[in-house]
């Protein structure tokens, strides 16, 4: 067990051009606060995955009012550290998200308004018990400077907080091979009792003989990197025996979600949707207040009006659930037009447009005919994201470069015979029909139903179609 501690040093405009406008104004004074979310391991986890190592919310900073005409300075910060307690071993590698929030203190109806100013994230290696590590992260035009460390809570010691200290049995010194427990010099390190051979980097124990593996490692001695490449099934959970995601019972079998939570399968394992008042991987954490930082993905926590609803999470766009833990499938609304492919990137929607279309939602039809030439007197027609040529008589193909066979489409009706002609085609009509395409029946009395044949042509003679 131990505590991860985060100290924010400054939050203000980053170097370079384009300094951000101050988030506060004389009309709208505001103050900052911060939220940190920790996850074990170095894996690229989605932003909405739970803060499995823990989360914390800072106090509010001093009220700040912008001085007219002055550039945005470093903004006044809350006092104190953000502390995230962890109950089990410190994993050594972790991912973090630090969010900077603005609380506007104007005349909003219904209390202050909150908005997310910046979010930074990273993945780091850190041994417990080590010195403060300094970091600088940029989010847009903003820059966040901070330090962090992990420290063990007595009696735990060591880089993973898994070794234990015991009061000295003798007043003067520790037993053979055992060191004093700095900084608790009056105590001694308990002997290491993990399984013989257990990897000191990737394994730890809480009971004699154990060798429990940190995330990403497996095998009897935690010496084997977990690899899913040789696994046949994507279905979990992770097996200590193989280091693979192995086929087996569904992750929701037996409903692992406590306190009335509902279980749904995910590609990697399962996800619990918790009733209000509970959170955690299995909805096992209760009695939660806003101080516990239960709202994920930038959700804003507000104290509930009664004991049964100790907090309410106001979710940012794109997230839902009692703890803002679920991402809304915004692509289901089919925002991309003209057949564009929708991509939900979490922080934004993107549309990948088909050829001939552009714009944030593929709403602009590009000029398909720009720079396109149709040969042999053809004219370009836009449409469908690809240009099309309407060809002059006797020509065809994509660009009207091919000489067309005018008889290929069998243009002569009622059994008329087609003859190619230098200026088009000629139909020789079967008895009883006339017209350029032999489309008109000849009346039995010799009169036609439509205008008479031109002078010099008898019904049944070939009709030249111009």
């Amino acid at each position: 067990a131990g505590v991860f501690e985060l100290q924010i040093h400054s939050f203000g405009p980053g170097p370079g051009p384009g300094a951000p406008r101050s988030p506060c104004s004389a009309r709208l004074p505001c103050r900052l606060f911060f939220r940190v979310c920790l996850k074990p391991g170095l894996s690229e986890e989605a932003a909405e995955s739970p803060c499995a190592l823990g989360a914390a919310l800072s106090a509010r900073g001093p009220v700040y009012t912008e001085q007219p005409g002055a550039p945005a300075p470093d903004l006044p910060l809350p006092d104190g550290l953000l502390q995230v307690p962890f109950r089990d071993a410190w994993p050594g590698t972790f991912s973090f998200i630090i969010e900077t929030w603005r609380e506007e203190l104007g005349d909003q109806i219904g209390g202050p308004a909150w908005s997310l100013l910046a979010r930074v994230a990273g993945r780091r290696r850190l041994a417990a018990g080590g010195p403060w590590a300094r970091d600088i992260q940029r989010a847009g035009a903003w820059e966040l400077r901070f330090s962090y460390r992990a420290r063990c809570e007595p009696p735990a010691v060591g880089t993973a907080c898994t070794r234990l200290c015991r009061p000295r049995s003798a007043p003067s010194r520790c037993g053979p091979g055992l060191r004093p427990c700095a900084p608790l010099e009056d105590e001694c390190e308990a002997p290491l009792v993990c399984r013989a051979g257990c990897s000191p980097e990737h394994g730890f124990c809480e009971q004699p003989g154990e060798c429990r593996c940190l995330e990403g490692w497996t095998g009897p001695l935690c010496t084997v990197p977990v690899s899913t490449s040789s696994c046949l099934s994507p279905r979990g959970p992770s097996s200590a025996t193989t280091g693979c995601l192995v086929p087996g019972p569904g992750p929701c079998d037996g409903n692992p979600c406590a306190n009335g939570g509902s279980c749904s399968e995910t590609p990697r394992s399962f996800e619990c949707t918790c009733p209000r008042g509970f959170y955690g991987l299995r909805c096992e954490v209760s009695g939660v207040t806003c101080a516990d930082g239960p709202c994920f993905n930038g959700g804003l926590c507000v104290g509930g009006a009664d004991p049964d609803s100790a907090y309410i999470c106001h979710c940012p766009p794109g997230f839902q659930g009692s703890n803002c833990e679920k991402r809304v499938d915004r692509c289901s609304l089919q925002p991309c037009r003209n057949g564009g492919l929708c991509l939900d990137l979490g922080h934004a929607l993107r549309c990948r447009c088909r050829a001939g279309f552009a714009g944030p939602r593929c709403e602009h039809d590009l000029d398909d005919c720009a720079g396109r030439a149709c040969a042999n007197g053809g004219t370009c027609v836009e449409g469908g994201g690809a240009h099309r040529c309407s060809c002059a008589l006797g020509f065809g193909g994509r660009d009207c470069r091919e000489r067309a066979d005018p008889c290929a489409a069998r243009p002569c009706a009622h059994g008329g015979r087609c003859y190619a002609h230098f200026s088009g085609l000629v139909c020789a009509c079967a008895p009883g029909y006339m017209g350029a395409r032999c489309e008109f029946p000849v009346h039995p009395d010799g009169a036609s139903a439509l205008p008479a044949a031109p002078p010099g042509l008898r019904p049944g003679d070939p009709q030249r179609y111009l």
Partner: antibody, heavy 119, light 107 residues
Framework: QVQLQQSGTELMKPGASVKLSCKAT????????IEWVKQRPGHGLEWIGE????????QYNEKFKGKATFTADPSSNTAYMQLSSLTTEDSAIYYC????????????WGQGTTLTVSS | DVQITQSPSYLAASPGETITINCRAS??????LAWYQEKPGKTNKLLIY???TLHSGIPSRFSGSGSGTDFTLTISSLEPEDFAIYYC?????????FGGGTKLELK
């Protein structure tokens, strides 16, 4: 000194179950894994699985899941392996062994229990 | 599973000779290989662990070498009590697996 004493020869009928025992002396039983190994003529040695008596944690070879079940009784310093639905394929010598305290291997072995399954 | 191929299966030698037994793993097992001796009427004995570490009480004529996939047990200046069956075992990955054994017989 460390010793692992296994139960005696067993003659069982097909379909029956049998519980083999392994009594440990000379060390703190709860802190070392007890390993179970099968030996059949022509098949060499096969790892069945292991149990950590202090926590009851187990690891099984997939091949023996459903066949073998490990338990341990710290009060009597004894580990057990139950084999169910016996067939003639289960006829073998079964060994228990201890994963060392400082040695990364099996530093002590039992003498073995011979199991014969025959109708 | 990690397959362990042990060779030779049989080996005939005389006291005073030096012999080698090889084990090859189907993939890297780092240094995590042990060698055991089996003799009738006796409990199995650990000789070498972690590829090359001699277990306490084992004579220095036994030695182990190798890492990754290829390992060797060498017995120099064979003694009469060394004629037995020898097994290697990997314990880097579950399931733990053994080689098929080498029977060392008196020539």
């Amino acid at each position: 000194q460390v010793q692992l004493q296994q139960s005696g020869t067993e003659l069982m009928k097909p379909g029956a179950s049998v519980k083999l025992s392994c009594k440990a002396t000379g060390y703190t039983f709860t802190g070392n894994w007890i390993e179970w190994v099968k030996q059949r003529p022509g098949h060499g040695l096969e790892w069945i699985g292991e149990i950590l008596p202090g926590t009851g944690s187990t690891q099984y070879n997939e091949k023996f899941k459903g066949k073998a079940t490990f338990t341990a009784d710290p009060s009597s310093n004894t580990a057990y392996m139950q084999l169910s639905s016996l067939t003639t394929e289960d006829s073998a010598i079964y060994y228990c062994a201890r994963w060392g305290s400082t040695v990364v291997a099996y530093d002590y072995w039992g003498q073995g229990t011979t199991l014969t399954v025959s109708s | 599973d990690v397959q362990i191929t042990q060779s030779p299966s049989y080996l005939a030698a005389s006291p005073g000779e030096t012999i080698t037994i090889n084990c090859r793993a189907s993939k890297s097992i780092s240094k995590y290989l042990a060698w055991y001796q089996e003799k009738p009427g006796k409990t199995n004995k650990l000789l070498i662990y972690s590829g090359s570490t001699l277990h306490s009480g084992i004579p220095s004529r036994f030695s182990g070498s190798g890492s990754g996939t290829d390992f060797t047990l060498t017995i120099s200046s064979l003694e009469p009590e060394d004629f037995a069956i020898y097994y290697c075992q990997q314990h880097n990955e579950y399931p733990l697996t053994f080689g098929g054994g080498t029977k060392l017989e008196l020539k």
